[in-house]
Each structure stands twice: as structure tokens, then as C-alpha cells.
């Protein structure tokens, strides 16, 4: 059986954000999955793309957010699983040769995904093939289903293809073209931050903001560091002692309508130790069980 | 070339339900939205719903739920628009359209006693 | 629903000249995900159906000559006929896709 949350190189303690660029080398973040997304169903096609996480040979953990259509943005429409792509064991985007891609089976938002406030942000992918895991795909452990989450001041990881670049805004992107994705992939270490201060900050802030308790926050007061556009359903991992494995605790969700990184505006995370019972059950095939590791 | 025909004119009674046929041609049929739009001398454009014919998957303009109902027939790659309790505010040209680009040639609905 | 407001509601000019025409949206109309502005230009002549001219606020639709150009981000929004034609004769509508579709008044263009 495949072990979950042990990659076969060691992650470093010193890590730099995705803000800013620090590239992950091979191997760092096996259970780390390219999501691209083409929408054909529309007029001109939409294409976007997001991360997720190997839970097992033949699942992908992400948020839901990335496998909606994005066309009607007050509308919860999930993309048919035709126009779904899955890279596994992907380092640089340019280069696609050493990768696994699958095509998916079936995708599955959660039923209560609310596209105002982001509360329920979880999917799953099923693929079509399982994935030949190796040295650079393996999967990532569930933690165990309790409602509290991750404490506050612990330190996590989070890896992704989105924005590296803070100083370009969304619609000097639109207007200039500029590249401003990461062709490597990049990775953050990032603190836990509280609910009362998360909630707090969002509150503060004109706009209609909502931290749920199925929602945690990470990141620095002074900003800096931090998940950006594209970096979306992506795996927030923490370490844990005990079993001496990572445990996707988050997924990259939302954060605040300013740059990326800004100063005391936390990235939110959806808070994966909710939705354990329900990722199990809807992965609830004889093989899917079997296949799936979770913390104990 | 890909075309959207459309039935053919409809004078209706205040309170009976029409429905309204647009064939599509030049394409696969069941991976594109077909969209209906809703046009009234002096209202402009107003945009009733989409349907998903592959699917059956539909979104609907709030201000038309309980009024458009849309179903498609993958085998004639047929889409249908079905209007009920009609009154003289129904009274309009209608469109079909796939997604954002190609328009049909329009059916013109009038109802009166 | 996104409120579209279009200026001015017509317009008259001489053949030749350059035409620019707005659209405005109640909110933003530019996805972060895709990077794309949902709004696009229609054409509606007499007694005819519309027919697209731009999608993504300014990408030009195969067919459409090129003195039309739509361009704008967010929630302004301008399309320009660089050199009208007696053919241009139409009424522009925009139409937003960003959530459920509203269209604008529409602006009637006459050619004197």
C-alpha cells in the first residue's frame, strides 16, 4: 500500500513564498496536482487552471471553486468532467514530459458550495486511470475528522503555480498579457493564523466578508508571503509529529480583494478536517477505501 | 456553417402556453449552451435562460422562473422554449442563440383576445 | 442582476467618420480565474437577428472587419467604428456574461 505524506525528498525548514518565487525542487510536493480546466460548453471556450492534491490513486482533492464554470458568477455549474485535466508529478508547466496526465471520470462539488461566501469550498476528481505512484506522485494524508482544525500559530506549506509576481495587478495582466505565472512550481511556509484575528481583519473591510468555522486563515500580519490567483485548491500541509507525516489541513481558497501578500490580509483556507466523512464517503468504492490513507 | 432555425410566428390567447422550436445545424449540438433572449419594441434585449442539451443542465433569468420552461432533443438537435399563461406582456420576438455568438432567425409570439 | 448602461442612446454621423460608443456595468465584469472581461458587442440591423462582433471586451469575432474595435476592463467599456459605413447602420447592443446576462439599451447608429 502506497504511503500517504512522505515524500521522498525532505522539504526543507527554510522556506521562502510563492510571492516572490522560491522553486520547489522535484519530488518536494509528490501529491501536488495541476488542474486545467477548458470549458468548451461556452462561447469563446474558457480555460483556467488551479492545484489540487492526490488523496489516492485515483483521487483528487481541491476546492470547488476551481471546477465551476465560470461564466455565471452567481451560479454553482460544475464543469463536465470532459474538460477536466489532471497533472501529477509536474515540476516546471513548460515541460509536461515527465508528467502523469489524466483525464477525469467524475467531479464532485460539495453539495452545500455557496458561491457568495466560499463556505464549503471542497471538491473532489475522479480519474479515469489510476496513477502509477512513484518517487514524484504519491498521495497526501487526510487528517483526522475533528471540528477544531489547525492551531493557531502552526506552520504549514502550501505549493503552487499562481502568481509569483506581487506588483502585477489582476488588470495589468488583462490589459498587458504579461506572464506573471510561475512555470516552476512554488512554495510558501505560512502561520496559522487565529479565527477571532482572521475574522476581525475581513470585518474591518468594506465588502461582505465571511470567515465560517469550515474556514481557516494563514499568513503574516506584515504580509509579504502568501497563496495568490492560480495557487486555488492547492493543499495547505502540516507536518505532524506524531505519525511523522503530512496532513492536508487546508485547501487554498480566497482572500481579500487586495494584492496578493498585502499587508494583514490573511489567505482563507478551507478547513479539510471538516469534510473528511463526507471525502470518504463519496470516494466510498470498495478499491477507493481501500487505496485511502487518513491520519490517526 | 453553423445556423439556429426557428419556428414560425405564433398568435396566441391571453392564458394559453406556446412552444417555441430552434433546430441547430453545423455543429455538435449537446456540447454547447443554447441561450434564449427576449426582445420588445421599446424593452431591448432581455435574457430569459440557458440550457445545457447534453445535460439537460438550465439556468434560468429569476424575473422568467415559472413562466420559460426549456427541454432539447439531442436526437433532432432540436432546443424548445415553452411559454405558459400567456398575457399581452409575452407578446415579443425571441431568440435562440448558442452561447455568445450565433443568433436564430427569430420567432415573433403575439398574444391577444 | 448587472445593471448595462449605454451612451448615447443614438447617434448620427457622416460616412468616413470615426464612431465611439460606451457601455458601463454595475460592477466588474473582469473574471480573476480566466483573466478575461465578460462583455461582448452586438449588432442588430433592421429587421434582422444580432450578431456578435466582440467578445472578451475587445477580442474581434472571425468575420468582423477590422475597423471595429471594442476595448475596456472592469467596468467601462467603449466600442470604436474607426470609419463608418452606410452598412454600419445598426443598433450596438453590449451584454454582460459575468453572472446572468443583462444586455445594454443599445445605441441606434443613423448615418446622415
Known amino acids: 500500500l502506497p504511503v500517504c505524506g512522505q515524500p521522498s525528498r525532505a522539504l526543507p525548514n527554510l522556506v521562502k513564498r510563492i510571492i516572490g518565487g522560491r522553486n520547489a525542487e522535484l519530488g518536494l510536493f509528490p501529491w501536488q496536482a495541476l488542474i486545467v480546466v477548458e470549458d468548451t460548453s461556452r462561447i469563446p471556450n474558457d480555460k483556467w487552471f488551479g492545484s489540487g492534491a492526490l488523496l489516492s490513486e485515483s483521487w483528487i482533492l481541491t476546492a470547488a471553486h476551481v471546477l465551476r464554470s465560470q461564466r455565471r458568477d452567481n451560479t454553482v455549474i460544475p464543469v463536465s468532467k470532459d474538460h477536466v485535466t489532471v497533472y501529477l508529478g509536474l515540476h516546471d508547466v513548460r515541460d509536461k514530459s515527465g508528467a502523469v496526465n489524466s483525464s477525469a471520470a467524475r467531479v464532485v462539488l460539495h453539495p452545500d458550495f455557496n458561491i457568495q461566501n466560499y463556505n464549503h469550498d471542497i471538491a473532489l476528481v475522479q480519474l479515469q486511470e489510476p496513477v502509477p505512484l512513484g518517487a514524484h506522485v504519491m498521495p497526501i494524508c487526510l487528517p483526522r475528522p475533528e471540528p477544531e482544525g489547525p492551531a493557531p500559530h502552526m506552520l504549514g506549506l502550501v505549493a503552487g503555480w499562481g502568481i509569483s509576481n506581487p506588483n502585477v495587478t489582476v488588470d495589468e495582466i488583462i490589459i498587458s498579457g504579461t506572464r506573471t505565472l510561475s512555470d516552476v512550481l512554488q512554495y510558501v511556509k505560512l502561520p496559522v493564523v487565529s479565527h477571532a484575528e482572521c475574522k476581525a481583519s475581513y470585518e474591518s473591510r468594506s465588502g461582505n466578508y465571511s470567515v465560517t468555522e469550515n474556514m481557516f486563515c494563514a499568513g503574516y500580519y506584515e504580509g509579504g508571503k502568501d497563496t495568490c490567483l492560480g495557487d486555488s485548491g492547492g493543499a495547505f500541509v502540516i507536518f505532524d509529529e506524531m505519525s511523522q507525516r503530512w496532513v492536508a489541513q487546508g485547501l487554498v481558497s480566497w482572500g481579500g480583494p487586495e494584492e496578493c501578500g498585502s499587508k494583514q490580509v490573511y489567505g482563507v483556507y478551507t478547513k479539510v478536517s471538516n469534510y473528511v466523512d463526507w471525502l470518504l464517503e463519496e470516494m466510498n468504492s470498495p478499491r477507493g477505501v481501500r487505496e485511502l490513507q487518513v491520519e490517526r | 456553417q453553423v445556423q439556429l432555425k426557428q419556428s414560425g410566428a405564433e398568435l396566441m390567447k391571453p392564458g394559453a402556453s406556446v412552444k417555441l422550436s430552434c433546430k441547430a445545424t453545423?455543429?455538435?449540438?449537446?456540447?454547447?449552451?443554447i441561450e434564449w433572449v427576449k426582445q420588445r419594441p421599446g424593452h431591448g434585449l432581455e435574457w430569459i435562460g440557458e440550457?445545457?442539451?447534453?445535460?439537460?443542465?438550465?439556468n434560468y433569468n429569476e424575473k422568467f422562473k415559472g413562466k420559460a420552461t426549456f427541454t432539447a432533443d439531442s436526437s433532432s438537435n432540436t432546443a424548445y422554449m415553452q411559454l405558459s399563461s400567456l398575457t399581452t406582456e409575452d407578446s415579443a420576438m425571441y431568440y435562440c442563440l448558442r452561447s455568445e455568438d450565433v443568433w436564430g432567425t427569430g420567432t415573433t409570439v403575439t398574444v391577444s383576445s | 442582476d448587472i445593471v448595462m448602461t449605454q451612451s448615447p442612446s443614438s447617434l448620427a454621423v457622416s460616412a468616413g467618420e470615426k464612431v465611439t460608443m460606451s457601455c458601463k456595468s454595475s460592477q466588474s465584469l473582469l473574471n480573476s480565474r480566466t483573466r478575461k472581461n465578460y462583455l461582448a458587442w452586438y449588432q442588430q440591423k433592421p429587421g434582422q437577428s444580432p450578431k456578435l462582433l466582440i467578445y472578451w471586451a475587445s477580442t474581434r469575432e472571425s468575420g468582423v472587419p477590422d475597423r471595429f474595435t471594442g476595448s475596456g476592463s472592469g467596468t467601462d467599456f467603449t466600442l470604436t467604428i474607426s470609419s463608418v459605413q452606410a452598412e454600419d447602420l445598426a443598433v450596438y447592443y453590449c451584454?454582460?456574461?459575468?453572472?446572468?446576462?443583462?444586455f445594454g439599451g443599445g445605441t441606434k447608429l443613423e448615418i446622415k
Open positions: 440550457i445545457l442539451p447534453g445535460t439537460g443542465s438550465t
Open positions: 451584454k454582460q456574461s459575468y453572472n446572468i446576462p443583462t
Open positions: 453545423g455543429y455538435t449540438f449537446t456540447g454547447k449552451w
